[in-house]
Interface confidence: medium
């Protein structure tokens, strides 16, 4: 019943995006935008786990907006959309769009912070600290305990960021966190602290330096 009567290439997939963001705090109004590569007659929004379309929009342009008002954590999940044209056969829809993960939360999960290759380094050597969350496209900040402002900021496409610490000022205790790159900002918990020390320095704590 649902097999298109022409090759799937005839029904190219749309693109689904979220505004203001795909990660938001509860109570925010979120707009999911389904954009087709050609003018469409009808758009359908689907949520993973539900076999019914969540919403339909009848339009005669390339995009449809689906409004989710004052979202709650329960509205988080995986969304995708499809579109169809009047001249397609009955029941023929486009291929599904990209999957959009909507996360509605007051606080993002705590990231991990690890040293590469390890937390004990040769004096004067560089060390890379990887702050890893579970969500791509976040802004990451690295802190040194005892220093109020972040040492480094990185906007990352991946769900992690690698901070390079150079040379003699490396030893100390570090932590990191991440947040959404734009408003409305959602922040993670801080990572567990990570102690970086020079080889042979024992458990000497350098956190008061600089």
């Amino acid at each position: 019943d649902f097999t298109p009567t022409a090759p799937l290439a005839s029904y190219p997939q749309p693109w689904l995006g979220a505004h203001p963001a795909a990660v938001v705090t509860p109570g925010i109004n979120v707009t999911l935008t389904c954009r087709a590569p050609q003018s469409a007659w009808r758009f359908a929004l689907f949520k993973s786990g539900l076999v019914t379309p969540l919403l339909l929009r009848d339009v005669s342009v390339e995009l449809a907006e689906f409004f989710l008002e004052e979202v709650t954590p329960a509205q988080g999940g995986s969304y995708h959309c499809r579109y169809r044209k009047t001249d397609w056969g009955p029941g023929v829809w486009s291929q599904p769009s990209n999957v959009l993960e909507l996360l509605v939360t007051d606080q993002l999960p705590r990231p991990s912070l690890v040293a590469l290759p390890g937390p004990v380094v040769a004096p004067g050597a560089n060390v890379s600290l990887r702050c890893a969350g579970r969500i791509p496209g976040m802004s990451f900040a690295l802190y040194r305990v005892g220093v109020a402002t972040p040492l480094q900021y990185i906007d990352s496409v991946q769900p992690w960021a690698d901070f390079l610490l150079i040379g003699t000022h490396t030893p100390g205790t570090y932590c990191c966190y991440y947040h959404t790159p734009s408003a409305p900002y959602v922040l993670s918990q801080r990572s567990q602290p990570l102690v970086i020390s020079f080889e042979g320095s024992g458990s000497l704590d350098y956190t008061q330096g600089n």
């Epitope: 649902f2 009808r42 539900l50 076999v51 019914t52 379309p53 829809w93």
Partner: antibody, heavy 118, light 109 residues
Framework: EVQLLESGGGLVQPGGSLRLSCAAS????????WTWVRQAPGKGLEWVSG???????NYAQNFQGRFTISRDNSKNTLYLQMNSLRAEDTAVYYC????????????WGQGTLVTVSS | QSVLTQPPSASGTPGQRVTISCSGS????????VSWYQQLPGTAPKLLIY???NRPSGVPNRFSGSKSGTSASLAISGLRSEDEADYYC?????????FGGGTKLTVLG
């Protein structure tokens, strides 16, 4: 006007087969999830099967294998093929259309009575 | 035996407020929407509440729905004789729709 009209019910012997139809009018049939729900005499509602906009049909456990749901989008019609019928399948069978907020059934047909008896 | 549990009967006098409960689990009500249906004698069910607390157009605001955790309830205020009917809750669980066993509401006097 939105309307659902079931047909195909009647008296059938145990072990027999029956095919129910549900003709829809007043909206774009192919855009919706369609379902069959039944109600045995004096009993409650029981979901039987559903036909999604995309993908495979789904069934309540009791009906998997014996019942087959299908749809003809060009005819705006939903079907239920019922095989190996038993006395306990005696019920009014309703077809219904699902809404868009996660699984309510907003429009129902008037129902068709299936009686399985020798 | 229904997965969603409703009291088999409820009653009230005209003008009263009556509440019907529906109890499920985290895999159905806890994680999905709840709907309520009214079935008058000899007729097909009619959607009364969807998405936990929304009323379709044409349903009087005397009917209201709510959900908390793994339970839901339907409240009918200003009870009328025409409200005498069977009421069913419904939710969703891994590609299956579930109905409660139904509650027969009797309007006394």
């Amino acid at each position: 006007e939105v309307q659902l009209l079931e047909s195909g019910g009647g008296l059938v012997q145990p072990g027999g087969s029956l095919r129910l139809s549900c003709a829809a009018s007043g909206f774009t049939f192919s855009d919706y999830y369609w379902t069959w729900v039944r109600q045995a005499p004096g009993k409650g509602l029981e979901w039987v099967s559903g036909s999604p906009v995309f993908g495979a049909a789904n069934y309540a456990q009791n009906f998997q294998g014996r019942f087959t749901i299908s749809r003809d989008n060009s005819k705006n019609t939903l079907y239920l093929q019922m095989n190996s019928l038993r006395a306990e399948d005696t019920a009014v069978y309703y077809c219904a259309k699902a809404g868009f907020t996660g699984g309510h059934f907003d429009i129902w047909g008037q129902g068709t009575l299936v009686t399985v008896s020798s | 035996q229904s997965v969603l549990t409703q009291p088999p009967s409820a009653s009230g006098t005209p003008g009263q407020r009556v509440t019907i409960s529906c109890s499920g689990s985290s895999s159905n009500i806890g994680n999905n929407y709840v709907s309520w249906y009214q079935q008058l004698p000899g007729t097909a069910p009619k959607l009364l509440i969807y998405g936990n607390s929304n009323r379709p157009s044409g349903v009087p605001n005397r009917f209201s729905g709510s959900k908390s955790g793994t339970s839901a309830s339907l409240a009918i205020s200003g009870l009328r004789s025409e409200d005498e009917a069977d009421y069913y809750c419904q939710s969703y669980d891994s590609s299956s729709w579930l109905f409660g066993g139904g509650t027969k509401l009797t309007v006394l006097g």
